[in-house]
């Protein structure tokens, strides 16, 4: 069962799924100037059995100008470098969570993929929230959201997270911190987790190697 709506929006926070439940679907979206090949899949599907899960179907983009030319699926190194979508294989990915039974890892990028990924989550999916750069997390409880089924309808639990405007970044679990935590501050205060459905997170490496994770809104 697909989750209705989006996960809750938290001011100055963004969300990420660390692993995707079987049944999750990912749109095959292409960047501007490219389109999905006519015979290509509309979605990728997380599928599998109790021991192994993987993504079915491959997304393929072709130039809008040359409609019948299929672009290669594997991105070139320089294209991978330019992509901003956070991937599960990055240092911020806790291996144990990605290896959960019945869950898929972040799918690898495909050539000329759009910069935003659009997921269709299923009941039981958990997402984690973090404050955007320049905001600090104040926890009242779990900074996560779960899609639950109640009385035949789905709902996302409300993450207990407030992001306050102090110039301090917070990280997803397992992600290296761009700077040391201020002395005396508990670790839990500088990491913030939360959950949402349609996941659109992007990462950008600044020249200073400071990592900035944020969601991109449609413009």
């Amino acid at each position: 069962e697909l989750c209705d709506d989006d996960p809750p929006e938290i001011p100055h926070a963004t969300f990420k799924a660390m692993a995707y439940k079987e049944g999750t679907m990912l749109n095959c979206e292409c960047k501007r100037g490219f389109r999905r090949i006519k015979s290509g899949s509309l979605y990728m599907l997380c599928t599998g059995n109790s021991s192994h899960s993987s993504w079915d179907n491959q997304c393929q983009c072709t130039s809008s100008a040359t409609r019948n030319t299929t672009k290669q699926v594997t991105p070139q190194p320089e294209e991978q470098k330019e992509r901003k979508t956070t991937e599960m294989q990055s240092p911020m990915q806790p291996v144990d969570q990605a290896s959960l039974p019945g869950h898929c890892r972040e799918p690898p990028p495909w050539e000329n993929e759009a910069t935003e990924r659009i997921y269709h989550f299923v009941v039981g999916q958990m997402v984690y929230y973090q404050c955007v750069q320049g905001y600090r997390a104040l926890h009242r409880g779990p900074a996560e959201s779960v899609c639950k089924m109640t009385h035949g309808k789905t709902r996302w639990t409300q993450p207990q997270l407030i992001c306050t405007g102090e110039m301090e970044t917070s990280q997803f679990p397992g992600e290296e911190k761009p700077q040391a935590s201020p002395e005396g501050r508990p670790e839990s205060e500088t990491s913030c987790l939360v959950t949402t459905t349609d996941f659109q997170i992007q990462t950008e490496m600044a020249a200073t190697m400071e990592t900035s994770i944020f969601t991109t809104e449609y413009q």
């Epitope: 697909l2 709506d5 989006d6 929006e9 679907m25 749109n27 095959c28 979206e29 292409c30 389109r35 999905r36 509309l42 979605y43 659009i118 269709h120 459905t197 349609d198 809104e217 449609y218 413009q219």
Partner: nanobody, 126 residues
């Protein structure tokens, strides 16, 4: 030139039903995802429902799930929104939208839709 034309709106009493239609010209619905959005006075545009042409994914906003049904007649290049058990809070202008890719739903889901109709007014009042 692509055109989407909504029809079927009107005034209905609470608990009543309406069936909205969306006629497309200039594109073929059999390779486009179709969606409905609505906008109430003084409020932001809100996602209502979407369905891709291959019927892989159909999504509804939780506020309408179980009451509204999105359907399509690809051969006739027409989409529909059957609205039952209407409530005063359903009052809005309803827009039909289409895009080449898969379903996009949720809060900020309007922008990825390439084509839009002019809208049809639905008023639920006693």
């Amino acid at each position: 030139q692509v055109q989407l034309q909504e029809s079927g709106g009107g005034l209905v009493q609470p608990g009543g039903s309406l069936r909205l239609s969306c006629a497309a010209s200039g594109i073929t619905f059999n390779d486009h995802t179709m969606a409905w959005f609505r906008q109430a006075p003084g409020k932001e545009r809100e996602f209502v429902a979407a369905r891709d042409w291959s019927d892989i994914i159909t999504r509804y906003a939780s506020s309408v799930k179980g009451r509204f049904t999105i359907s399509r007649d690809n051969a006739g290049n027409t989409g529909f929104l059957q609205m039952n058990s209407l409530r005063p809070e359903d009052t809005a202008v309803y827009y039909c939208a289409a895009r080449e890719g898969g379903v996009v739903a949720g809060v900020r889901s309007g922008a990825p839709y390439d084509y839009w109709g002019q809208g049809t007014q639905v008023t639920v009042s006693s």
